[in-house]
């Protein structure tokens, strides 16, 4: 299709543009260019006849146009009025017309912009500043840059006047930056010189450094004061309210106990007229003090609280050391030391974090140790454990149950039988029990500090006869050559012997069979399909014996390699082909057939009536077991011969 491409599309005044023609047909009579979106003889720029190679100017010809033999039109010394559409009209050799329209836009070259400001020294949190990008230019886009980055999103920044004005409301010190504006149109982009915004601010509350407040007698005291301020602040020092000097630093050599007191730094900003002060209390010790540990939390809760241990006092030029359980600190992501090593933070304390903890201050000759501190970590109660673990008792014996749950403070215990409260003790003792003492025995552990409670329930059966046991299994459908199965004989009973039978026989000797847990558990490793048998467990004591119902192990296996029957591979034309596929598998597999690789049907039997030599090929049976996730297949070649061509061929079904 005939198309016009304007190169460039956006043209600067005074430059030139080429209306480039694409897909110009062959065998032309000629072509004409028109100003506008249609063929209009009154707006013809120029015409060109191929045969005579003659160009004829039209009414819209300005003398700045050059037409090329490939029909492209060059317009030179572009003026604003040249903006718009141009139509090329092509007449082919057979006098068939074709036309295409292109367009371009004309823009002026932009001058270098500059920034004007309504406030050269705005005061922080008080003044607004409006920057305006000069000059105002038609059809130009205005952009702003702060430190050579595009404008950040902020409710204090507002663009107006077609983005030509940038207003900063309630200026802050962070607005002190290099500001540039840029003017753009499609043919040029110019950026202004940068304007630095000078925001007056402060002084902020001064900071006195170093931060430590404890000194030893004989040291030099060197305090420095700093307050963020523009212009820079003027500083004054006061000791116990008395003016000392107008300097940023205060130096007192060889201090004594008498130099203890309150030290005040005052910062003043002459432009904003503001004053701010900060006071620090300095203590001068005659001797290095014995350190001690303070804690921000004396009773932290396990897995909830963090604890910050701080070594006091704070002394200048001192090294702080820590020990836990009389060892140096272990490496742990839950242990964090502050930059000066004075504070040790334990994140998310556990019951194992009790300590003891010690800190030390190292001086020239020795290390002074604090007294040890032990953390009282509140935890628990954990799930209580009832011992012993027996659930069956004979009448006449004594029942003695003990309950324990890890807890700090120690748990308070309660016993319930069949939901009825019995006593608030850790141990429950009932002498000479009878069948009536059978029931649900609940131990409840309570932590008074955390308010948390946990319970454990145990079923106690008192009976002269042992109950009929049952078998529990950890895997009801194990996969052959992959899974293990553990059978457990329930219940657990006191003074009881556990026995096992497989298919009515005592256990065979096998490295894959293992008894454990007082013969109460039978484990079969790497099960096979031959393990799919009836398993029975038995319990017996001096007065009775009982056997469980059999449990048959359902082993999932296969599919094995399938067999296609009948085995014949040669058939006579006209016979019926009746192939049956079978594969050992549990559960039964899904069957499918493919003939020469083409899927056929999902049946176990493949039947084709009256076969011909066209039925020659490979017959594949595919089997899949969805339970084991395994697949298998077999391929059989079938040859069909025309009737009577070869002896010994199967007549088929």
């Amino acid at each position: 299709k005939l198309t016009i491409e304007s190169t460039p599309f956006n043209v600067a005044e005074g430059k030139e543009v080429l209306l480039l023609v694409h897909n110009l047909p062959q065998h032309l009579f000629g072509y004409s260019w028109y100003k506008g979106e249609r063929v209009d003889g009154n707006r013809q720029i120029i015409g060109y006849v191929i045969g005579t190679q003659q160009a004829t100017p039209g009414p819209a010809y300005s003398g700045r146009e050059i037409i090329y033999p490939n029909a492209s039109l060059l317009i030179q010394n572009i003026i604003q009025n040249d903006t718009g559409f141009y139509t090329l009209h092509v007449i082919k050799s057979d006098l068939v017309n074709e036309e295409a329209t292109g367009q371009f836009r004309v823009y002026p070259e932009l001058p270098k912009p500059s920034i004007s400001s309504n406030n050269s020294k705005p005061v922080e949190d008080k003044d607004a500043v409006a920057f305006t990008c000069e000059p105002e230019t038609q059809d130009a886009t205005y952009l702003w840059w702060v430190n050579n980055q595009s404008l950040p999103v902020s409710p204090r920044l507002q663009l107006s006047n077609g983005n030509r004005t940038l207003t900063l409301f309630n200026v802050t010190r962070n607005d002190t930056a290099s500001y540039k504006c840029e003017t753009q149109n499609p043919v040029s982009a110019r950026r202004s010189d940068s304007v630095i915004l000078n925001v007056l601010y402060g002084p902020d509350a001064p900071t006195i450094s170093p931060l430590n407040t404890s000194y030893r007698s004989g040291e030099n005291l060197n305090l420095s004061c700093h307050a963020a301020s523009n212009p820079p602040a003027q500083y004054s020092w006061f000791v116990n309210g008395t003016f000392q000097q107008s300097t940023q630093e205060l130096f007192i050599p060889n201090i004594t106990v008498n130099n203890s007191g309150s030290y005040t730094c005052q910062a003043h900003n002459s432009d904003t007229g503001l004053n701010r002060t900060t006071v620090t209390t300095i203590t001068v010790y005659a001797e290095p003090p014995k350190p001690f540990i303070t804690s921000n939390n004396s009773n932290p809760v396990e897995d909830e609280d963090a604890v910050a241990l701080t070594c006091e006092p704070e002394i200048q030029n001192t090294t702080y050391l820590w020990w836990v359980n009389n060892q140096s600190l272990p490496v742990s992501p839950r242990l964090q030391l502050s930059n000066d090593n004075r504070t040790l933070t334990l994140l998310s304390v556990t019951r194992n974090d009790v300590g003891p903890y010690e800190c030390g201050i190292q001086n020239e000759l020795s290390v002074d140790h604090s007294d040890p501190v032990i953390l009282n970590v509140l935890y628990g109660p954990d799930d209580p454990t009832i011992s012993p673990s027996y659930t069956y008792y004979r009448p006449g014996v004594n029942l003695s149950l003990s309950c324990h749950a890890a807890s700090n403070p120690p748990a308070q215990y309660s016993w319930l039988i069949d939901g009825n409260i019995q006593q608030h003790t850790q141990e429950l003792f009932i002498s000479n029990i009878t069948e009536k003492n059978s029931g649900l025995y609940t131990c409840q552990a309570n932590n008074s500090a955390s308010g948390h409670s946990r319970t454990t329930v145990k079923t106690i059966t008192v009976s002269a006869e042992l109950p009929k046991p049952s078998i529990s299994s950890n895997n009801s459908k194990p996969v052959e050559d992959k899974d293990a199965v553990a059978f457990t004989c329930e219940p657990e009973a006191q003074n009881t012997t556990y026995l096992w039978w497989v298919n009515g026989q005592s256990l065979p000797v096998s490295p894959r069979l293992q008894l454990s847990n007082g013969n109460r558990t039978l484990t079969l490793f790497n099960v096979t399909r031959n393990d799919a048998r009836a398993y029975v467990c038995g319990i017996q004591n001096s007065v009775s014996a009982n056997r469980s119902d059999p449990v048959t192990l359902d082993v999932l296996y296969g599919p094995d390699t399938p067999i296609i029957s009948p085995p014949d591979s040669s058939y006579l034309s006209g016979a019926n082909l009746n192939l049956s596929c079978h594969s050992a598998s549990n559960p039964s597999p899904q069957y499918s057939w493919r003939i020469n690789g083409i899927p056929q049907q999902h049946t176990q039997v493949l039947f084709i009536a009256k076969i011909t030599p066209n039925n020659n090929g490979t017959y594949a049976c595919f089997v899949s077991n969805l339970a084991t996730g395994r697949n298998n297949s077999i391929v059989k070649s079938i040859t069909v011969s025309a009737s009577g061509t070869s002896p010994g061929l199967s007549a088929g079904a």
């Epitope: 209009d40 060109y48 003659q54 017309n97």
Partner: antibody
């Protein structure tokens, strides 16, 4: 001055043939496209055929395609229309016309006075 | 092929009248439309080309307009020599003419 003069018209029986000529003067014939337009008695104008300056490009109306042939001899400044298998409905005044050598959408700026062709038994 | 339909097929008017003849194409032909004037016994004469461009030597009372499918020839003030038959012609392929509009003296 541009002049176009047609000749060769006359009475012819259905199925017969006729050759029309158009002698051109007053312009550069060899670089001009030329065409034939006809007008049946009391009817409107019907474009018949056109030919490019070098005889390479020819076009015909469906009604005459396969029966009429347009040709030119640039050395003689003459345009021809060979009409075969003539029918009664071909009866008309046949005009020779020029396409100008400024590429406007195709138009016929100069016409001859026409020659009458009558097809009748 | 593209069909050209002129209306009206005939028209009576007086000297000094403003006359409008319309031509409709069966499909869009852009601006590829020419108007011709033919007087009895004479060859046609080109008036307007490219829908609206006046052929050199044609009086300015003749004007053309339209694009796509609908076109108009207007004679702003009829003169005695303007009574003739007017044809529109589409300059596509093939170059078919309208059936003509006969302009007569009232």
């Amino acid at each position: 001055e541009v002049q176009l003069l047609e000749s060769g018209g006359g009475l012819v029986q259905p199925g017969g043939s006729l050759r029309l000529s158009c002698a051109a003067s007053g312009f550069t014939f060899s670089s001009s496209y030329m065409g034939w337009v006809r007008q049946a008695p009391g009817k409107g104008l019907e474009w018949v055929s056109s030919i490019g300056s070098g005889s390479y490009s020819t076009s015909y109306a469906d009604s005459v395609k396969g029966r009429f042939t347009i040709s030119r001899d640039n050395s003689k400044n003459t345009l021809y229309l060979q009409m075969n298998s003539l029918r009664a409905e071909d009866t008309a005044v046949y005009y020779c016309a020029r396409y100008p050598s400024v590429p406007f959408p195709p138009l016929l700026d100069y016409w001859g006075q026409g020659t009458l062709v009558t097809v009748s038994s | 092929d593209i069909q050209m339909t002129q209306s009206p097929s005939s028209l009576s008017a007086s000297v000094g009248d403003r006359v409008t003849i319309t031509c409709r194409a069966s499909q869009s032909i852009s601006s590829y439309l020419n108007w011709y004037q033919q007087k009895p016994g004479k060859a046609p004469k080109l008036l307007i080309y490219a829908a609206s461009s006046l052929q050199s030597g044609v009086p300015s009372r003749f004007s053309g307009s339209g694009s796509g499918t609908d076109f108009t020839l207007t004679i702003s003030s009829l003169q005695p020599e303007d009574f003739a038959t007017y044809y529109c012609q589409q300059a596509g392929n093939p170059h078919t003419f309208g059936q003509g509009t006969k302009l007569e003296i009232k």
